[in-house]
């Protein structure tokens, strides 16, 4: 056969769905890899083709649509299950073409089984709720297009094993679940149930996302260095080892990036020459506050590193700040023999 | 001395992914980022993201958010970046550098030419 | 993102002469904190990776001539060859590090008149 596009297996869209319920999985040739829709393929004569590659196997075979029910059907550029089985499980493959043109790409499908709480093999997304922020909400996610804007499902939500009913703070409001006032004992897994009609046949669709309480923005604040700060002096002789912690406590911010590091003398550690060795520790509070320890060592410091400059920098979204460290040379205790014996003129 | 020494010519399909690699010598891998860069012939630079050897975080630009994964193996003092489902105007030279936080790239890779071609 | 824009396209300088080339910035790319513009400029000869010029819009570094200096701040920036070269003959690229995603400046193509 003539040449085909072929832009391999798609891991990026790991796809999960959970056994005996309705799945539609759209063709990622229009969503991600083909610069036009499917509506522009269709009409310019273009046809997409399904066919799969079960678990395990290499062959790869034309889907079945004649199944009782229409369990698998094809509508524009979506697979439809209704529903899925556990075997379905495998690497399906999309491809569009007509006599001059082809393009295709495969991407793995995974059935999975969820036990009565719901627990499961399923990556979970997670929702991070800022504590005692005020109502917030989590939507019911990934249940756009399985049934008409007409047809009312039925929507329980449950908080790992138990149904949602007369919770303190957490209300469930159709396929919103509101949080008056998220607190630390929110963190949890929340489940949706959707049910639905269809055809004379009921169809549920389950969706778990993992919530994650999390420090407000209206709590954040640069961030603060702890050490070095103005108390402390790291007073060494030469030969000694030198170190110096930079711990630096990090708000909790939305997609922020927190960093620390070192200057010497203004400069990257690498471009002095000294033996500088940097090591990093990071440790989150339960509201995934950070803090962030870098300690600087010198194995065997000289007195010429101890009238050095070293500065400890940090970074988050809220800002920068840097703090030196106070070095200083130890001035060594007076020997009574020599020192001492000689300032009362003995010889 | 401090160097970036990376992996040699590539010529690709379209739809195909490509690895490369950058092996750092001469300073301490984990103190530094590592930054992609691609020049399109004739074309400026376009920065494609970074990883932080120490931790392996990463921030890729929104363009290649889909397509793009860094890595590093901090054994061998070495970074990858790998691009999936490529295109030809992905044919361009693929620079590394590193940064000290925010003192600019100062150390580049030679470059390595992929070639995206039916 | 931050938009990057160099003027001019292209420069050409007699040897020993000034040579300018200009960078804005599309928001100010000053962190008020430590009072550091987050710009870099970069010099790329044909064939060869780009070159650390200056960072931090003014600071040289290690290694490059004096006759490079780099000037201002918050969105306008401006990199001066004092007195050009034969081998400052390249490209020239602005960067701003201030926000990913970074981006550059188109570049300026400075040539000998």
């Known amino acids: 056969s003539e040449r085909c596009d072929d832009w391999g297996l798609d891991t990026m869209r790991q796809i999960q769905v959970f056994e005996d319920e309705p799945a539609r999985i759209k063709c990622p040739l229009f969503e991600h890899f083909l610069k036009f829709n499917y509506s522009t393929a269709h009409s310019a004569g273009l046809t997409l083709i399904w066919y799969w590659t079960r678990q395990d196997r290499d062959l790869e075979e034309p889907i079945n649509f004649r199944l009782p029910e229409n369990r698998i059907s094809k509508e524009k550029d979506v697979l439809w299950f209704r529903p899925t089985l556990l075997n379905d499980t495998g690497n399906y493959t999309c491809m569009l073409r007509n006599t001059t043109y082809c393009s295709k790409v495969a991407f793995p499908l995974e059935v999975v089984q969820k036990d009565s709480c719901f627990n499961s093999p399923m990556k979970l997304p997670v929702h991070k709720l800022y504590i005692e922020y005020g109502i917030q909400r989590i939507t019911c996610p990934n249940v756009d297009g399985y049934f008409p804007s007409s047809v009312k499902p039925t929507i329980t939500w449950y908080m790992g094993c138990y149904k949602i009913q007369n919770f303190n703070n957490v209300i469930p409001e159709g396929m919103n679940l509101s949080f008056l006032i998220a607190l630390i004992s929110n963190n949890g897994n929340y489940t949706c149930v959707v049910t639905y009609p269809e055809n004379g046949r009921t169809f549920h669709l389950t969706r778990t996302l993992t919530v994650k309480v999390v420090g407000s923005p209206k709590n954040a604040v640069p961030p603060v260095i702890h050490s070095p700060n103005d108390h402390v002096v790291y007073e060494k002789e030469p030969g000694e080892e030198l170190l110096i912690p930079c711990t630096v406590y990090f708000s909790f911010l939305m997609d922020s990036r927190n960093e620390v590091w070192w200057t010497i003398d203004g400069k990257k550690p690498d471009d002095i020459t000294i033996d500088v060795t940097i090591n990093e520790s990071i440790s989150h509070s339960r509201t995934e506050d950070e803090t962030r320890t870098q300690i600087l060592s010198i194995k065997k410091v000289t007195s010429e590193d101890l009238k050095r400059s070293y500065v400890c920098h940090a970074r988050s979204a809220k800002g920068e700040v840097a703090k030196a460290a106070k070095v200083k040379q130890k001035v060594p205790a007076p020997r009574y023999t020599v020192e001492l014996a000689c300032g009362f003129g003995a010889t | 001395q401090v160097q970036l020494v990376q992996s040699g010519a590539e010529v690709k399909r379209p739809g195909a992914s490509v690895k490369v690699s950058c092996k750092a010598s001469g300073y301490t891998f984990t103190g530094y980022y590592m930054h992609w860069v691609r020049q399109a012939p004739g074309q400026g630079l376009e920065w494609m993201g970074w990883i932080n050897p120490y931790s392996g975080g990463t921030d890729y630009a929104q363009k290649f958010q889909d397509r793009v994964t860094m890595t590093r193996d901090t054994s061998i003092s070495t970074a990858y970046m790998e691009l999936s489902r490529l295109r030809s105007d992905d044919t361009a030279v693929y620079y590394c550098a590193r940064s000290y936080y925010y003192y600019g790239m100062d150390v580049w890779g030679q470059g390595i030419t992929v070639t995206v071609s039916s | 993102d931050i938009v990057m824009t160099q003027s001019p396209d292209s420069l050409a300088v007699s040897l020993g002469e000034r040579a300018t080339i200009n960078c804005k910035s599309s928001?100010?790319?000053?962190?008020?904190?430590?009072?550091?513009?987050?710009l870099a400029w970069y010099k790329q000869k044909p064939g060869q990776p780009p070159k650390l010029l200056i960072y931090w819009a003014s600071t040289r570094e290690s290694g490059v001539p004096d006759r490079f200096s780099g000037s201002g701040s918050g969105t306008d920036f401006t990199l001066t060859i004092s007195s050009l070269q034969a081998e400052d003959v390249a490209v020239y690229y602005c960067q701003q590090y201030y926000s990913t995603p970074f981006t550059f400046g188109g570049g300026t193509k400075v040539e000998i008149k």
């Open positions: 928001q100010n790319i000053i962190n008020s904190s430590t009072n550091k513009n987050y």
